[in-house]
């Protein structure tokens, strides 16, 4: 029979023939031949392959480096690699994290909409009219003014984006 | 006092294996990653391999990668650098050494580094035939 | 990987007079948190490695005030104000940014 020009899925072409392609986790040791199968080994530890395969090495695991800010979020395995993230306060500047940066902070003025996450930045947005923030801060949001009324006050300075009401006494009608 | 004993050293040949063991003492071993660092007769130093402080991390430099394996046994306080299919050019002092760390600096950063604080007193590996 | 240099290889010293080690890297040391990862070894003749600075300028516990280290990104300097005849040995920098760890090639103090 004619040799084969292309190989099926998992299995691909090494000298005139089709051999069956290393599962996931597995490395290749050696090709098939007409009387034998394709020989492979899995990975050791700390190391990795995640698809079908004809490698020969295995891929080591991503070491998450404190110094750096990260951790693992996910022990690898030998079909997968280790899955960093980044410690509290600190968030990821690529979908593979590789490095972390500090967690931004929402100046007065602003209040924070969406807390950072290990992988995305803290998210601010400014205090609308009748709320303040007098701080720089990744956690509080946008405080309301004091409502002066229920407290039976009068406000005697204007809020503002960064400031509260100020409230004082009514002024008594002398009879 | 903090203390790193290395062991295991000695003379091999091609292709045998060897494992050093390095002993702590003086201080928490589960809190701190480590490292072996290696030095060859009249050279400078070289990085071998890292291992988290829990051990589920680890990574080794591409010259010994697949045939050196760094790990730990954090209830002995002893760190291991197993050496298999040892070559000539693998003679050389091999060092533990501690990565230093604190709790959070002044910037918000999570763990502090501190360099490389503590070191042992080496371990000579030679491969002859 | 990042490559470290060294310069110069060698640095014979007088007693009592300045000395100073320059160390360059590939690429920026310098981390979003503001740090630079560069640490300074010395190796005494016959002994291990022992840490002197580490983030670039900070000295390690127990190392007199004589050492200091400075510079940013890919240039670093370690200098020694007055050199003591117990400052001799192989002085290394090493980057801390990156796995793996690379060391520089060393510099070599000797008195003259």
């Known amino acids: 029979p004619e040799p084969p020009t292309a190989c099926r899925e998992k299995q691909y072409l090494i000298n005139s023939q089709c051999c069956s392609l290393c599962q996931p986790g597995q490395k290749l040791v050696s090709d098939c031949t007409e009387f034998t199968e394709t020989e492979c080994l899995p990975c050791g530890e700390s190391e990795f392959l995640d698809t079908w395969n004809r490698e020969t090495h295995c891929h080591q695991h991503k070491y998450c480096d404190p110094n750096l800010g990260l951790r693992v979020q996910q022990k690898g395995t030998s079909e997968t690699d280790t899955i960093c993230t980044c410690e509290e306060g600190w968030h990821c500047t690529s979908e593979a994290c590789e490095s972390c940066v500090l967690h931004r902070s929402c100046s007065p003025g602003f209040g924070v909409k969406q807390i950072a996450t290990g992988v995305s930045d803290t998210i601010c947005e400014p205090c609308p009219v009748g709320f303040f923030s007098n701080v720089s801060s990744a956690f509080e949001k946008c405080h309301p003014w004091t409502s002066c009324e229920t407290k039976d006050l009068v406000v005697q300075q204007a809020g503002t984006n960064k400031t509260d009401v100020v409230c004082g006494p009514q002024d008594r009608l002398r009879a | 006092q903090v203390q790193l004993v290395e062991s295991g050293g000695g003379v091999v040949q091609p292709g045998r294996s060897l494992r050093l063991s390095c002993a702590a003492s003086?201080?928490?071993?589960?809190?701190?990653?480590m490292h072996w660092v290696r030095q060859a007769p009249g050279k400078g130093l070289e990085w071998v391999a890292v291992?988290?402080?829990?051990?589920?991390?680890?990574y080794h430099a591409d010259s010994v990668w697949g045939r050196f394996t760094i790990s730990r046994d954090n209830s002995r306080s002893t760190l291991y650098l197993q050496m298999n299919s040892l070559r000539a050019e693998d003679t050389a002092v091999y060092y533990c050494?501690?990565?230093?760390?604190?709790?959070?600096?002044?910037?918000?950063?999570?763990?502090?580094?501190?360099?490389?604080?503590?070191w042992g007193q080496g371990t000579t590996v030679t491969v002859s035939s | 990987d990042i490559v470290m240099t060294q310069s110069p290889l060698s640095l014979p010293v007088t007693p009592g007079e300045p000395a100073s080690i320059s160390c360059r890297s590939s690429?920026?040391?310098?981390?979003?948190?503001?740090?630079?990862?560069l640490d300074w070894y010395l190796q005494k003749p016959g002994q291990s490695p022992q840490l002197l600075i580490y983030?670039?300028?900070n000295r390690a516990s127990g190392v007199p005030d004589r050492f200091s280290g400075s510079g940013s990104g890919t240039d670093f300097t370690l200098k020694i104000s007055r050199v003591e005849a117990e400052d001799v040995g192989v002085y290394y920098c090493?980057?801390?940014?990156?796995?793996?760890?690379?060391f520089g090639q060393g510099t070599k103090v000797e008195i003259k």
């Open positions: 291992i988290s402080n829990d051990g589920d991390n680890k």
């Open positions: 090493m980057q801390a940014l990156q796995t793996p760890r690379t």
């Open positions: 983030l670039g300028s």
């Open positions: 050494a501690r990565r230093g760390m604190g709790s959070s600096g002044s910037r918000g950063d999570y763990y502090y580094y501190y360099g490389l604080d503590v």
């Open positions: 690429q920026s040391l310098l981390y979003s948190n503001g740090y630079n990862f």
């Open positions: 003086g201080f928490t071993f589960s809190s701190y990653g």
